[in-house]
């Protein structure tokens, strides 16, 4: 039959950061193509990435409809040039993905320090509120919009002239910290979702130091 050399997809893996979500799998196709389907536990299957020779499929548009739902995907394998052909049981070969709950599992992207402003012995450090692909009322929501108080940021800061670090946490996107007058400080932030058990922390933001462009100083 035409399915003799068709192999099922394997190693189905969700790759998701700030809700941008791609399903990846193996193997690279040889004389076969793939179609992906996705559904919620209680929903209908929706087909995506029809008859593709890629080994990835962007499912962001589907998962952002409700990031708190749990999704399942499956990858169908068809013989190239004969996509109507079915497997021995009368249906195409397919493999299921692990379940994926975006709200609980999407990786937190590397944050960015938007600005810092010194007024006397206080510095206000602001973290950029990154836009996600999650929509509400035709507008894209920010990370803070989606996670609310579930999202905190940890700030690490230190004098440029010394190695001793301090830390602070915020449940907004701003820190107000005390500094020594006349000293330059460096800053790095990390996003955290403390209620999670996996993918809890982002990587650190790039380090920003006073005396560089992002800062502002007022007596």
């Amino acid at each position: 039959s035409g399915t003799t050399n068709t192999v099922a997809a394997y190693n189905l893996t969700w790759k998701s950061t700030n809700f941008k979500t791609i399903l990846e799998w193996e193997p690279k196709p040889v004389n076969q193509v793939y179609t992906v389907q996705i559904s919620t536990k209680s929903g209908d299957w929706k087909s995506k990435c029809f008859y593709t020779t890629d080994t990835e499929c962007d499912l962001t548009d589907e998962i952002v409809k409700d990031v708190k739902q749990t999704y399942l995907a499956r990858v169908f394998s068809y013989p190239a040039g004969n996509v109507e052909s079915t497997g021995s049981a009368g249906e195409p070969l397919y493999e299921n993905s692990p379940e994926f709950t975006p709200y609980l599992e999407t990786n937190l992207g590397q944050p960015t320090i938007q600005s810092f402003e010194q007024v006397g012995t206080k510095v206000n450090v602001t973290v950029e509120d990154e836009r996600t692909l999650v929509r509400r009322n035709n507008t894209f929501l920010s990370l803070r919009d989606v996670f609310g108080k579930d999202l905190i940021y940890t700030l690490y800061y230190w004098k440029s002239s010394s190695s001793g670090k301090k830390t602070a946490k915020t449940n907004t996107n701003e820190f107000l910290i005390d500094v020594d007058k006349g000293e330059n400080y460096c800053f790095s932030v990390q996003a955290v979702i403390p209620s999670r058990t996996v993918n809890r922390k982002s990587t650190d933001s790039p380090v920003e130091c006073m005396g560089q462009e992002k800062g502002e100083f007022r007596e």
Epitope: I152, K165, K169, Q190, V192, P194, T197, K201, T203
Partner: antibody
Framework: QVQLLESGAVLARPGTSVKISCKAS????????MHWVKQRPGQGLEWIGG????????MYDPKFQGRVTITADTSTSTVFMELSSLRSEDTAVYYC??????????WGQGTLVTVSS | DIQMTQSPSSLSASVGDRVTITCKAS??????LSWYQQKPEKAPKSLIY???SLADGVPSRFSGSGSGTDYTLTISSLQPEDFATYYC?????????FGGGTKVEIK
Amino acid sequence: QVQLLESGAVLARPGTSVKISCKASGFNIKDYYMHWVKQRPGQGLEWIGGDDPANGHSMYDPKFQGRVTITADTSTSTVFMELSSLRSEDTAVYYCARDSGYAMDYWGQGTLVTVSS
Amino acid sequence: DIQMTQSPSSLSASVGDRVTITCKASQDIKSFLSWYQQKPEKAPKSLIYYATSLADGVPSRFSGSGSGTDYTLTISSLQPEDFATYYCLQHGESPYTFGGGTKVEIK
């Protein structure tokens, strides 16, 4: 389940150093922050410092800065605290604790360090 | 550094009593406040996190409230196993600071 297992009791001479350990199981230490807390006999709790094993950032209470070093070995899920220039006031139980971001939610059983000549 | 003032330092109460312990921070700690129970010769145990949330396995007679600089731990009906020392901890910024502790004794 989550466990923090600390090393055994230590007797040390004044002026020397001790290094105590805390082996974590049931979670990945890189996903959390790890801290050390001191409790002298009959006294309250005192934060010494903490570490983010994911990036190596360590923070210390200024009272201990320069005498304490906190490190983490992610390959063995172990956190260490080294305290140098020991004095009698360092006689205490030392606890390691996991910080979720919301609280120190799990604690080790404590390590008694006795400083005596 | 942020100072945590915990009161009272000790109290005597009977089984069934309602007990309230307070912690006042020297500046806004944005709810990064947790409460711990410690019994003699034992490690502290987490009771309340993020000012108001009950830790896993903790009886519902324990509750936390407050925001900004003022926080409260309440035990609605004291049980025999609740006689212990209680500590608050601010972890909004380093150095983290504990309250001085409240010893709850049997009247």
